[in-house]
């Protein structure tokens, strides 16, 4: 995965965010997959930094060593500090594991910035507040990284919840929710609700703030609002999904469908931002220019490189519009849209220099590697990784960041023709030539 | 100019012991790999062990495995091979050679620049 | 392991001959191939990384070409001083790696 300010990535900061919450509505879904209503015990287990990625505990080996784990729906690997690091607190240490199994195998990730190699093996695996099980799992010891671990960040590992696909070295390692769904009884299902902080945290604040919650096996009631819409996965290697339509505060960017997916869409809880085409992300920002142009923002703000800044509590959320995107749905020609305010792609930021200021970057960019719908969109929604079922559930986050005048929503059906023609299908080309140099 | 120096060889019995040293210069010897290849009297190239560049991930031959341990001292500019249990089949000159980058276990890669070798006779 | 075999594993030409060596892998290994030289009692000295690319300072009449299992290293004008023998090395997976088992250019 991994992708431009891919990882990591911003984090869910306070639980439950200042704001106001929506009431609870009547579930209209029928029968989901799996476990229903309160997972109490999964609730409220992640955490996390901004910008830096939502973290849940885990522990590997015997006696278990507890780590802190990013949770990452845009990779495959579950790989762990595993050498000592000067951003890392504590890491896997296999010597002293009885139940540790070498692989004898080398694994080497490079992301767009910073990457990763360390040495294959499996291990068991549990997760203190998820489901009570204990699984052997594959596991990419991190020996090596540049530009990966962030300092401060308090996560040891990455979690990759995607499919076996896009596993390094390559989709014969088994990905580490493949291996909890075979040797348990747990649901082929998992659910993440993200709580974006909404206001800058200081250190202290940040590191006691709740994030927000994995639900493993299920979906559970209380972390949404109204009802779940699912759309397709459109092909299990990324959580890859189809936009039908995108919307500046209504208005369409009437651009061919299949521009939104070029060359994919993805739900990647491990990227901090919304990431446009280029085509798309120009069409996107002169409409949010317009929309706003009651202010006049630096062409660096646009672009992600500068902060703007208005006095504590006087942010003018109001001049900023909605962002629609309407996905594909689960009855032919039907779609459905999620709705994310200013709250949620304006990403708050501590800047030591104003601190009485409310401080913000915008977190929408541009990709050339497809859409990837990060933490920006997810903070706005309960999102359901339905692979049983092959789609993906949004519902509106009872946890979301709004004010008294908006709300993020989910709303459908819409009409909309011909969307499997909003699909790119990528050419199959021969590996890339990374060139390096070897030991 | 980047220069790698390799020393320790000599003759030693079967089941003993030596240490090589490969003293680096002229390039940020903790940004790259570095590997050990040998080469038997007569004979073709053998990769033996390598690396990486803060010396996290290391790897080696199964020929010489659990005999054989490769390490570095980035603050010294020093890679080194410890041998232990010498058979006869490890007489050869080994040389040490920098990786391009300090990763192990990247494609794409190459051995380049390599030192002048060091003998290791290993004999009754 | 992924296992590198060389052709010929000798050969003898005249100074200006084009000469032709080949270098096959077991598997595919893309383009990630590289060629070496070595001299009697000298340590080996890389001429070609990634198939094709010449490692700077090696002159031009040497190349590379292939992809996939079958790489070819060319010299197009043989010169008194490449007479050495040629090794191939694959670095598409990841350690251990090995060589082929050489080529022994020698004068005719």
């Known amino acids: 995965t991994h992708l431009g300010i891919r990882l990591p990535l911003r984090s869910g900061l306070a639980g439950p965010p200042l704001g106001l919450r929506l009431p609870r509505e009547t579930d209209e879904e029928s029968e989901e997959p799996g476990r229903r209503g309160s997972f109490v015990e999964m609730v409220d287990n992640l955490r996390g930094k901004s910008g830096q990625g939502y973290y849940v505990e885990m522990t590997v080996g015997s006696p278990p060593q507890t780590l802190n784990i990013l949770v990452d729906t845009g990779s495959s690997n579950f790989a762990v500090g595993a050498a000592p690091h000067p951003f890392l607190h504590r890491y896997y240490q296999r010597q002293l594991s009885s139940t540790y199994r070498d692989l004898r195998k080398g694994v080497y990730v490079p992301y767009t910035q910073g990457k990763w190699e360390g040495e294959l093996g499996t291990d068991l695996v549990s997760i203190p507040h998820g489901p009570n099980v204990t699984v052997r799992a594959n596991i990419a010891a991190i020996t090596e990284s540049d530009k990966f671990f962030i300092n401060g960040s308090n996560w040891e590992g990455i979690l990759g919840l995607a499919y076996a696909e896009i596993a390094r070295p390559d989709d014969s390692l088994e990905p580490f929710f493949d291996s909890l769904v075979k040797q348990t009884h747990i649901p082929n299902i998992f659910s993440l609700q993200l709580c974006g902080a909404g206001f800058p945290l200081n250190q202290t604040e940040a590191l006691a703030s709740v994030g927000g919650s994995m639900i493993i096996g299920g979906i559970d009631h209380s972390l949404y609002t109204g009802r779940l819409w699912y759309t397709p996965i459109r092909r299990e290697w990324y959580y890859e999904v189809i936009i039908v339509r995108v919307e500046i505060n209504g208005q369409d960017l009437k651009m061919d469908c299949k521009e939104y997916n070029y060359d994919k869409s993805i739900v990647d809880s491990g990227t901090t931002n919304l990431r446009l085409p280029k085509k798309v992300f120009e069409a996107a920002v002169k409409s949010i220019k317009a929309a706003s142009s009651t202010e006049k923002f630096p062409d660096g703000f646009w672009l992600g490189e500068q902060l703007v800044c208005w006095q504590a509590g006087t942010t003018p959320w109001n001049i900023f519009p909605v962002i629609s995107l309407y996905l594909m749905g689960e009855v032919t020609n039907q779609s459905f849209r999620i709705t994310i305010l200013p709250q949620q792609y304006l990403r708050p930021v501590e800047d030591v220099a104003t601190s009485q200021d409310d401080c913000y970057k915008f977190a929408v960019s541009q990709s050339s590697t497809g859409t990837v719908m990060g933490a920006v969109i997810m903070e706005g929604f309960y999102v359901v990784f339905d692979r049983a079922r092959k789609r993906i559930g949004f519902a509106v986050s009872a946890c979301h960041v709004h004010d008294e005048f908006r709300t993020a929503a989910v709303e459908g059906p819409f009409v909309t023709a011909d969307m499997e023609d909003c699909g790119y299908n990528i050419p199959q080309t021969d590996e890339s030539t990374l060139m390096t140099g070897r030991a | 100019e980047v220069q790698l120096l390799e020393s320790g060889g000599g003759l030693v019995q079967p089941g003993g012991s030596l240490r090589l040293s490969c003293a680096a210069s002229?390039?940020?010897?903790?940004?790259?790999?570095m590997s050990w290849v040998r080469q038997a009297p007569g004979k073709g190239l053998e990769w033996v062990s390598a690396?990486?560049?803060?010396?996290?991930?290391?790897y080696y031959a199964d020929s010489v495995k659990g005999r054989f341990t490769i390490s570095r001292d980035n603050s010294k500019n020093t890679l080194y091979l410890q041998m232990n249990s010498l058979r006869a089949e490890d007489t050869a000159v080994y040389y040490c050679?920098?990786?391009?980058?300090?990763?192990?276990?990247?494609?794409?890669?190459?051995?380049?620049?390599w030192g002048q070798g060091t003998l290791v006779t290993v004999s009754s | 392991d992924i296992q590198m075999t060389q052709s010929p594993s000798s050969l003898s030409a005249s100074v200006g001959d084009r000469v032709t060596i080949t270098c096959r892998a077991s598997?595919?290994?893309?383009?990630?191939l590289n060629w070496y030289q070595q001299k009697p009692g000298k340590a080996p000295k890389l001429l070609i990384y990634?198939?094709?690319s010449l490692q700077s300072g090696v002159p031009s009449r040497f190349s590379g070409s292939g992809s996939g299992t079958d790489f070819t290293l060319t010299i197009s004008s043989l010169q008194p001083e490449d007479f050495a023998t040629y090794y191939c090395?694959?670095?598409?997976?990841?350690?251990?790696?090995?060589f082929g088992g050489g080529t022994k250019v020698e004068i005719k």
């Open positions: 050679a920098k990786g391009g980058s300090q990763w192990l276990y990247a494609p794409g890669s190459w051995f380049d620049p």
């Open positions: 002229g390039f940020t010897f903790s940004s790259y790999a």
């Open positions: 690396i990486s560049g803060s010396g996290g991930s290391t």
């Open positions: 598997q595919s290994i893309s383009s990630y």
């Open positions: 990634a198939a094709s």
């Open positions: 090395d694959e670095s598409y997976s990841t350690p251990p790696w090995t």
